[in-house]
């Protein structure tokens, strides 16, 4: 997150981290039920660990943290390259969470976000637009949903209904490492960090997010059948 601020501890209890090896964070994720996470399809890796209830970027133990393995990764069947449509993936964890003030699921928005809606994006991704500067703790950033027209003008021929744009204030954006993390609007999960230009946080190059309102049925059906 570029030019965000430290999240309040436990203010994003649905925020998850996907880890490679012992503790190399490579993507964000979102807890949507006691045993299921959502993340971006482009975050798919064969082996990873899941960390919930953690505030710090470092692997230091925190009392609220819970660690899990992913036992099933189910990317949306329509995820495609190079267009990046349908950029979402369900992860089933090896057990259910212990519900606590640090770890709670978030409800997915059934209605699509409208232009001007204020939302919050969070993550442990790089805090510099073009270099690797990682934060000490989870970062939060208020962003505004942009019109479909403005989104398509920013990225001609690259936006479809499975995406929405948000942000666009120069110097403020999600960035590398935030992928798969939550965009929460009015207390409901509206999107996932999907993609954007490099360097991050350029004028008229907003962040692009997976438009989860388009996938409520697929998410429910997939969880029920697995």
């Amino acid at each position: 997150i570029v030019n965000g601020s430290d999240c309040q501890k436990d203010a994003q209890p649905w925020q998850g981290a996907l880890l490679l090896g012992p503790n190399k964070l490579y993507c964000g994720a979102v807890l949507i039920s006691p045993q299921w996470l959502l993340t971006a399809a482009h975050c798919r890796k064969p082996v990873f660990r899941i960390r919930l209830g953690h505030h710090s970027m470092s692997p230091v133990y925190e009392s609220g943290q819970q660690m899990f393995q992913g036992i099933k990764s189910i990317p949306h069947p329509g995820y495609s390259h190079p267009g990046h449509s349908n950029d979402l993936m369900l992860i089933k964890m090896n057990r259910k969470i212990r519900d606590s003030h640090s770890v709670k699921p978030v409800e997915i928005a059934c209605d699509c976000a409208t232009e001007g809606t204020r939302c919050m994006v969070s993550g442990w991704g790089t805090t510099s637009s073009s270099h690797n500067n990682f934060p000490k703790v989870l970062q939060c950033l208020n962003i505004t949903v942009l019109s479909e027209e403005r989104c398509k003008n920013s990225y001609p021929g690259q936006i479809d209904k499975t995406m929405f744009c948000a942000g666009d204030e120069e110097g403020r954006d999600s960035c590398q490492g935030d992928s798969g993390g939550p965009v929460v609007c009015n207390g409901k999960l509206q999107g996932l960090v999907s993609w954007g230009d490099f360097p991050c946080a350029q004028r008229n190059r907003p962040g692009v997010y997976t438009n989860l309102c388009e996938f409520v049925k697929w998410i429910k059906d997939t969880m029920n059948s697995n």
């Epitope: 190079p82 270099h131 690259q158």
Partner: antibody, heavy 127, light 108 residues
Amino acid sequence: QLQLQESGPGLVKPSETLSLTCTVSGGSISSLDYYWVWIRQPPGKGLEWIGSIDYSGDTYYNPSLKSRVTISVDTSKNQFSLKLSSVTAADTAVYYCARGRPLGYGARHYYYAMDVWGQGTTVTVSS
Amino acid sequence: DIQMTQSPSSLSASVGDRVTITCRASQSISSYLNWYQQKPGKAPKLLIYSASSLQSGVPSRFSGSGSGTDFTLTISSLQPEDFATYYCQQSPYFPPLTFGGGTKVEIK
């Protein structure tokens, strides 16, 4: 300012293994943001991608060379290496190492342009 | 594999001329197309990335356009130092990363 420098033997015998190293100076090879790439150019011909490695150690190889290629990173020495086994005269080329800079973040991070190159090293395969 | 076809393979032009080189992909690559310049005995140099973005330090007489399958590199007013070979390159999620065959720009 980032600089890349290839090193290794200029002459390799047929059927042997070609080994090259690229030393990165002026920046960290363990950066999350970049790919590290090997490309070659046979005499008088165009550019051919050999393979790449990313921050997590994931490798991507040209399918036409995959069975013979290994790319690895040594973060402690800020180097990445190429090994090409069972070489023939057709592997004679100028070998370049380069940095792949992503064209975006997130799903776009897998697409990149080579923005910094080594000067190249000539490898001849001959007995 | 995605094939990249460059045309022409060579061209002769004079200083001050407007030069256009085209590159066609065998399937859509969105805007993931880069252009390089290579002079004899030297490593390639990145000119344009993401189809139309000018690499830092590259003169503004170079420009790129296109998306999907058809792309163009334009040199608005050819300078003596621009005589070189130009390559397009598609940047893949799935390997292989491929280059066009090159366009040699020679002095008329």
